[in-house]
């Protein structure tokens, strides 16, 4: 529209004006995990906490059993950290046994699932290397970016070891998405 | 507004459309922090560039006092990066004592101070162990979410040591905030 | 214009209103990188995947020569992951040595390139040492920030050593920006 | 006001200890590394080592290792600096030094003279 | 441990002169690179941190450049308070190491 006189019924046609305090948008927060059956050969997804404290849905954005449900179709800004925590990790008990460092590992991979595809798609992926020296060790990894989805699709986060997410506080562990 | 006539004295009354350029937003750049009081029991907090180099505050979002101030009401994506930099870590030589390795560590904390509220709200947190080998260690913590905000709330980054923070260029620390 | 009626013809004189869907934007993905002459004295640049899988680039956003050319002024958000791999430091080998531990280190630059400056600008930096003890290693770095951009700006991702990236998967190195 | 007051002139026999203080003012003592620098009459600047005034974590110059002993007390915003088994060539002006980051010194006391003599 | 060497060891010069002092590490220090100046019976000030940044209250005829291994201090036009004894010192890695000194005399 640059330099173009405002002209609503010529611009509706290809790409309607938004306010932009209705588009979908959430912020999920951590709640402590409960055991429950997982996909097999899939990380195990983590549910969240959607409207208590800082988290909040809007705008026909809906979380439901662990997905956050894309209610419109558009370029969506995705992004997630998942805090870790952990008591020594294997790689320093490998390393004292004298046998090779095969390092422990931490994901956070962020998942569309689309109903028509029969294979969910990974749309973020950290993964790090835990060879810690100390007894006790803790750190985010954090994911963000920006991608087209569809109407329909749903998204989720799936961590490498769901009993190491540090559940303790919402500004910790949090995922969200919201319509560019 | 999908599929629905361009309305806009009906849309005017929950959601006015607004012109991007004309949001609220800031990026703010590290500055060497100067020794000063800190709040008691919380984290020190960080003073920031705002109008230098890539640093900068536009329509209504003002920096002064370590806060950034907000001036709108609405959804607004927040972010920070602090990188750290030490010479050894304590873990180290606690561990050269054979006591057990309680880690060093460092957090970053992006905090929102609302008046009417006694106490400030964490909004998003990272937090990881340090218990490195080598003498010289550095390493970012990056943060970012989106938060609905209320006019007159105000922002700032609070660090668990504020002594380890790099100083050194615009590009490694950062904090910043915009209207979506 | 909070509180104010909606006034096009006054909006339109200071900032037109756009359609969302009609911004520049774009979201790369990792390819192997092929050795390639990189400039003197500074990182080596990455190269992308701009259309294939997960990536695109749309609404003038174009991406030529390892660049992402920058169609209009405006306020951008820029982000990138890179994701490192390594066998052992040459830190844990200093140091069985006895030798003074100099880390090693991972870095990413993301940079600015305006053909009327001389020289680049560094807009985002994200630097680790790395001392790990396992032998295997891999981690990601993550950046993301608001930046002012002119027409014809271009946007690139430096790495400190391009044969420690991370080519297998395009969740897992990324680079993206978007008009706000 | 920022400061530090370090405690005044000390003449020590060779062998014997000495121990310097640093009161802090006008900042948050604990969110700022203290350093101890000493400076030998007409000489350059020597580092000895920092504490960590929040956790009571120390870094001492190898040169010190064994001979120094930083310490703090939080109630008082106090640092202190104790070197044993003094030896001639540690007469000297004993600064405590802080500053906003980790490896530059804003701020420096007055400077303790410590005299080791027979 | 990084050894700093500083030239001049002394130097003469006269008010209203432009002096160089220039400070080389011996391994890259990046740009943790300090600058002070002593006074006869007075504490170090701090100059120029991170080897180009002006410390807060120092007058601007004071600079500083430099990145890696070698840095020079500038100043632009010597005032009488200016004479006194300048001292480079690394914050890159422990210990912190200071260079020689730099003493500046009246011509």
């Known amino acids: 529209l640059k330099g173009q006189e405002f002209a609503p019924s010529h611009q509706q046609v290809y790409a309607p004006l938004r306010a932009d305090g209705d588009k979908p948008r959430a912020h999920l927060t951590v709640v402590r995990q409960t055991p429950t059956q997982h996909f097999k050969n899939q990380f195990p997804a983590l549910h969240w906490e959607h409207e208590l404290g800082l988290a909040f849905t809007k705008n026909r954005m809906n979380y439901t059993n662990k997905f956050l449900l894309i209610p419109e179709s558009g370029d969506y800004f995705i992004y997630s950290q998942v805090t870790f925590r952990g008591m020594t990790s294997e790689c320093s008990e490998i390393r004292q046994a004298g046998r090779p460092n095969k390092p422990d590992s931490i994901t956070v991979v962020i998942t569309k699932v689309t109903d028509s595809y029969p294979e969910p798609t990974q749309l973020l992926m950290g993964t790090k290397s835990v060879c810690e020296v100390g007894s006790n060790w803790f750190q985010p990894i954090y994911l963000g970016a920006m991608f087209s989805l569809q109407e329909g699709d749903k998204l989720m986060v799936n961590v490498s070891d769901i009993s190491l997410v540090d559940y303790t506080k919402e500004d910790k562990t949090f995922f969200g998405a919201f319509l560019l | 507004l999908k599929g629905q006539e361009f309305a806009p004295s009906h849309q005017q009354v929950y959601a006015p459309l607004r012109a991007d350029g004309d949001k609220p937003r800031a990026h703010l750049t590290v500055v060497r922090q100067t020794p000063t009081q800190h709040f008691k029991n919380q984290f020190p907090a960080l003073h920031w560039e705002h109008e230098l180099g890539l640093a900068f505050t536009k329509n209504r979002m003002n920096y002064t006092n370590k806060f950034l101030l907000i001036p709108e009401s609405g959804d607004y994506f927040i972010y920070s990066q602090v990188t750290f930099r030490g010479m050894t870590s304590e873990c180290s030589e606690i561990r050269q004592a054979g006591r057990p390795n309680k880690p060093d560590s460092i957090t970053v904390v992006i905090t929102k101070v609302t008046d009417s509220y006694p106490e400030p709200t964490q909004l998003l947190m990272g937090t990881k162990s340090v218990c490195e080998v080598g003498s010289n260690w550095f390493q970012p913590i990056y943060l970012g979410a989106m938060f609905s905000l209320q006019e007159g709330d105000k922002l700032m980054v609070n660090v668990s040591d504020i002594s380890l923070v790099d100083y050194t260029k615009e590009d490694k620390t950062f904090f910043g905030a915009f209207l979506l | 214009l909070k509180g104010q009626e909606f006034a096009p013809s006054h909006q339109q004189v200071y900032a037109p209103l756009r359609a969302d869907g009609d911004k520049p934007r774009a979201h790369l993905t990792v390819v192997r990188q092929t050795p390639t002459q990189h400039f003197k004295n500074q990182f080596p640049a990455l190269h992308w995947e701009h259309e294939l899988g997960l990536a695109f680039t749309k609404n003038r956003m174009n991406y030529t020569n390892k660049f992402l050319l920058i169609p209009e002024s405006g306020d951008y958000f820029i982000y990138s992951q890179v994701t490192f791999r390594g066998m052992t430091s040459e830190c844990s080998e200093i140091r069985q040595a006895g030798r003074p531990n100099k880390p090693d280190s991972i870095t990413v630059v993301i940079t600015k390139v305006t053909d009327s400056y001389p020289e680049p600008t560094q807009l985002l930096m994200g630097t680790k040492s790395v001392c790990e003890v396992g032998s295997n290693w891999f981690q990601p770095i993550y950046l993301g920030a608001m930046f002012s951009l002119q027409e014809g700006d271009k946007l690139m991702v430096n790495v400190s050593d391009i044969s420690l990236v991370d080519y297998t998967k395009e969740d897992k190195t990324f680079f993206g920006a978007f008009l706000l | 006001e920022v400061q530090l007051v370090e405690s005044g002139a000390e003449v020590k026999k060779p062998g014997a200890s000495v121990k310097v203080s640093c009161k802090a003012s006008?900042?948050?003592?604990?969110?700022?590394?203290m350093h101890w620098v000493r400076q030998a009459p007409g000489q350059g600047l020597e580092w000895m080592g920092w504490?960590?005034?929040?956790?009571?974590?120390?870094n001492y110059a190898q040169k010190f290792q064994g001979r120094v002993t930083m310490t703090r007390d939080t109630s008082i915003n106090t640092a202190y600096m104790e070197l044993s088994r003094l030896r001639s060539d540690d007469t000297a002006v004993y600064y405590c030094?802080?500053?906003?980051?980790?490896?530059?010194?804003?701020?420096w006391g007055q400077g303790t003279m410590v005299t080791v003599s027979s | 441990d990084i050894v700093m060497t500083q030239s001049p060891s002394s130097l003469s010069a006269s008010v209203g002169d432009r002096v160089t002092i220039t400070c080389r590490a011996s391994?890259?220090?990046?740009?943790?690179l300090n600058w002070y100046q002593q006074k006869p019976g007075k504490a170090p000030k701090l100059l120029i941190y991170?080897?180009?940044r002006l410390q807060s209250g120092v007058p601007s005829r004071f600079s500083g450049s430099g990145s890696g291994t070698d840095f020079t201090l500038t100043i632009s036009s010597l005032q009488p308070e200016d004479f006194a004894t300048y001292y480079c010192?690394?914050?890159?890695?422990?210990?912190?190491?200071f260079g020689p000194g730099t003493k500046l005399e009246i011509k």
């Open positions: 030094a802080s500053g906003g980051s980790i490896d530059a010194f804003d701020i």
């Open positions: 391994q890259s220090i990046s740009s943790y």
């Open positions: 010192q690394q914050g890159f890695s422990t210990p912190f190491t």
């Open positions: 006008g900042y948050t003592f604990t969110a700022y590394y």
């Open positions: 991170g080897a180009s």
């Open positions: 504490i960590n005034p929040n956790s009571g974590g120390t």
